[in-house]
Interface confidence: low
């Protein structure tokens, strides 16, 4: 359906508070280093140009593209050269052009400071002071940290962030009821934030067929009563909704992720029996609710999958005709009996099935050829189902301070070139697989590993494309979107690293070591062991533990101590001598 | 809820002609390649001819090529298939299926070529 002026059918559908929201949203991912008030303007001059035109659609400018009309209020930014470089250069170009070269500017780790939490009553006298101002400033804070945050949910978030503070604000204990809040708010974000840096990834570089593909098999797993054709229509809303949000169009995949829920509860009767809680809720926290359903029962009758996908004399006919559509029935039909599976071993069987139709049905006997074609699944299937269990064994028999730091080994021995921030940044988030998956039930633990860790390497990913250091990454990151988790897992010591030479002021530790919270003690210990791990990468587990276990008892006597800075100064060379004997 | 109901069947003399419709509901059609699928008395389904969801490609079993034509109205939400120079060996239940699936989704129509 054509509107004379696309900004104004925006604004009518999305209504203003998502309108202005989303705008904010929009330029704070494009410019992540413009001040608040820069960006409020900007976003008030639009909002004011959009209801020109919905009071006059035929109003000069109103039947230009979003991405014009946009692209044409970012590049009035009277900084832009001395705060961005070579991103000023965008706007010398032509749309759509112009809107491809913000896209390939935005940048996954900003040189932003970390946001410090103020005291509770200052943040409370803020909320009461400018409640839109307040929100606006969470909205802008959060998006210019992640770029790809998915505009629609951030809404969400805001709205609960609004509540929280709502709340807690008249609480006798104020603190004490937000701070949880805030805590929870924080990390749901960051997975958030995460999760859906994967789905662009996913879609930018290996195509909206790899998109799909995921979506089928996870769809098929939530919704195992559907059709293939109901789940192929949500596949193909979905993957609609998610190319318009990580290409920036983000007015547009607000509006169809509503439809897209609209559709999902008028036709909860063929799509799962889980949708109605979720469908009497307010628009935002219904998206949510929907994105986040449980699976629902499988259905009790469903036969082999042999009959139609390997005894079939037809195979081959079946895959020539269509390839696409009888792989994804395929998927569809193997996804719905195998919620124990991750989707990203889902994708592997469907690949292998995929491999041994194109290598059989060129045979002289492809029935022959592709009958023990579930046998090779075997193998596939029993990797991540090992891998789970022995890492979730490690986990409870470390805890999870000390499986991170096994994981800091491992990873920093596999690609010792990738920065030190980024090991223990990704190192720490693989840990936290444990306490998220390993309390699961069985059927439960794979699903929920798996899928996970690979959010957690399309970090390393995205951060190593940033700044390339290591082939072995690059090529686990670019082969196979299905593959990068075995492509790690495979991994092994690097054998053509040059150990980094020893720096002393790398271990030369403060007093202020002291005053950290224990997740900052934690990062600095953890920071060490890397650097350790680079000096001496084939310094055995017993030899790591050792100066780990030195360095924590050398910190705590420190702290301990009345005159801690002039302990840190005559126990830290000591510390040092002491390691690098241990480690020669 | 996805519908598809087919109409158009009936008995006809050896090269004859008929035309089937499918009428579908419940999804978006135009999003999706379609096929029609028959199947004869105490044999197994059988792919007849697929179209995408443009319209554009058109694909027809080796049995049936130059006799039957395949054709949408995305606007309609309608499937066709036109059968000409009909033969008894056509004979079967017709049903139109979504992408190019061979598992029935609905009733069908039936078709009978007498010699």
């Known amino acids: 359906d054509t509107h004379k002026s696309e900004v104004a059918h925006r604004f009518k559908d999305l209504g203003e508070e998502h309108f202005k929201g989303l705008v904010l949203v929009a330029f704070s991912q494009y410019l992540q280093q413009c001040p608040f008030e820069e960006h409020v303007k900007l976003v008030n001059e639009v909002t004011e140009f959009a209801k020109t035109c919905v009071a006059d659609e035929s109003a000069e400018n109103c039947d230009k593209s979003l991405h014009t009309l946009f692209g044409d209020k970012l590049c009035t930014v009277a900084t832009l050269r001395e705060t961005y470089g070579e991103m000023a250069d965008c706007c010398a170009k032509q749309e759509p052009e112009r809107n491809e070269c913000f896209l390939q500017h935005k940048d996954d780790n900003p040189n932003l400071p970390p946001l410090v939490r103020p005291e509770v009553d200052v943040m409370c006298t803020a909320f009461h002071d400018n409640e839109a101002t307040f929100l606006k400033k969470y909205l802008y804070e959060v998006a210019r940290r992640h770029p790809y945050f998915y505009a629609p949910e951030l809404l969400f978030f805001a709205a609960r962030y609004k509540a929280a503070f709502a709340e807690c604000c008249q609480a006798a204990d104020k603190a004490a009821c937000l701070l949880p809040k805030l805590d929870e708010l924080r990390d749901e974000g960051k997975a958030s934030s995460a999760k859906q840096r994967l789905k662009c990834a996913s879609l930018q570089k290996f195509g909206d067929r790899a998109f799909k593909a995921w979506a089928v098999a996870r769809l098929s797993q939530k919704f195992p009563k559907a059709e293939f054709a109901e789940v192929s229509k949500l596949v193909t809303d979905l993957t609609k909704v998610h190319t318009e949000c990580c290409h920036g169009d983000l007015l547009e995949c607000a509006d169809d992720r509503a439809d897209l829920a609209k559709y999902m509860c008028e036709n909860q009767d063929s799509i799962s029996s889980k949708l109605k809680e979720c469908c009497d809720k307010p628009l935002l926290e219904k998206s949510h609710c929907l994105a986040e359903v449980e699976n629902d029962e499988m259905p009790a009758d469903l036969p082999s999958l042999a009959a139609d996908y390997v005894e079939s004399k037809d195979v081959c006919k079946n895959y020539a005709e269509a390839k696409d559509v009888f792989l994804g029935m395929f998927l569809y039909e193997y996804a719905r009996r195998h919620p124990d599976y991750s989707v990203m071993l889902l994708l592997r069987l469907a690949k292998a099935y995929e491999a041994t139709l194109e290598k059989c049905c060129a045979a002289a006997d492809p029935h022959e050829c592709y009958a023990k074609v579930f046998d090779e699944f075997q193998p596939l299937v029993e990797e991540p189902q090992n891998l789970v269990k022995q890492n979730c064994e490690l986990f409870e028999q470390l805890g999870e301070y000390k499986f991170q730091n096994a994981l800091l080994v491992r990873y920093t021995k596999k690609v010792p070139q990738v920065s030190t921030p980024t090991l223990v940044e990704v190192s720490r988030n693989l840990g936290k697989v444990g306490a998220k998956c390993c309390k699961l039930p069985e059927a439960k633990r794979m699903p929920c590993a798996e899928d996970y860790l690979s959010v957690v390497l399309n970090r390393l990913c995205v951060l190593h494309e940033k700044t390339p250091v290591s082939e072995k990454v690059t090529k686990c990151c670019t082969e196979s979107l299905v593959n990068r988790r075995p492509c790690f897992s495979a991994l092994e010591l690097d054998e053509a690293y040059v150990p980094k030479a020893f720096n002393a002021e790398t271990f030369t530790f403060h007093a202020d070591m002291c005053t950290l919270s224990e997740k900052e003690k934690q990062v600095k210990k953890q920071t060490a062991l890397v650097e350790l791990v680079k000096h001496k990468p084939k310094a055995t587990k017993e030899q790591l533990k050792g100066v780990m276990d030195n360095f924590a008892a050398f910190v705590e006597k420190c702290c301990k101590a009345d005159d801690k800075e002039a302990c840190f100064a005559e126990e830290g060379p000591k510390f040092v001598a002491a390691s690098q004997a241990a480690l020669a | 809820q996805v519908q598809l109901v087919e109409s158009g069947g009936g008995l006809v003399q050896a090269g004859g002609s008929l035309r089937l419709s499918c009428a579908a509901s419940g999804f978006t059609f135009g999003s999706f390649g379609m096929s029609w699928v028959r199947q004869a008395p105490g044999k197994g389904p059988e792919w007849v001819s697929a179209i995408d969801s443009g319209g554009v490609d058109t694909r027809y079993a080796e049995s049936v090529k130059g006799r039957f034509t395949i054709s949408r109205d995305n606007a309609k939400k309608t499937l066709y298939l036109q059968m000409n120079s009909l033969k008894p060996e056509d004979t079967a239940v017709y049903y139109c299926?979504?992408?190019?699936?061979?598992?029935?989704g609905s009733q069908g129509t039936q078709v009978t070529v007498s010699s």
């Open positions: 299926t979504i992408g190019q699936s061979t598992s029935r």
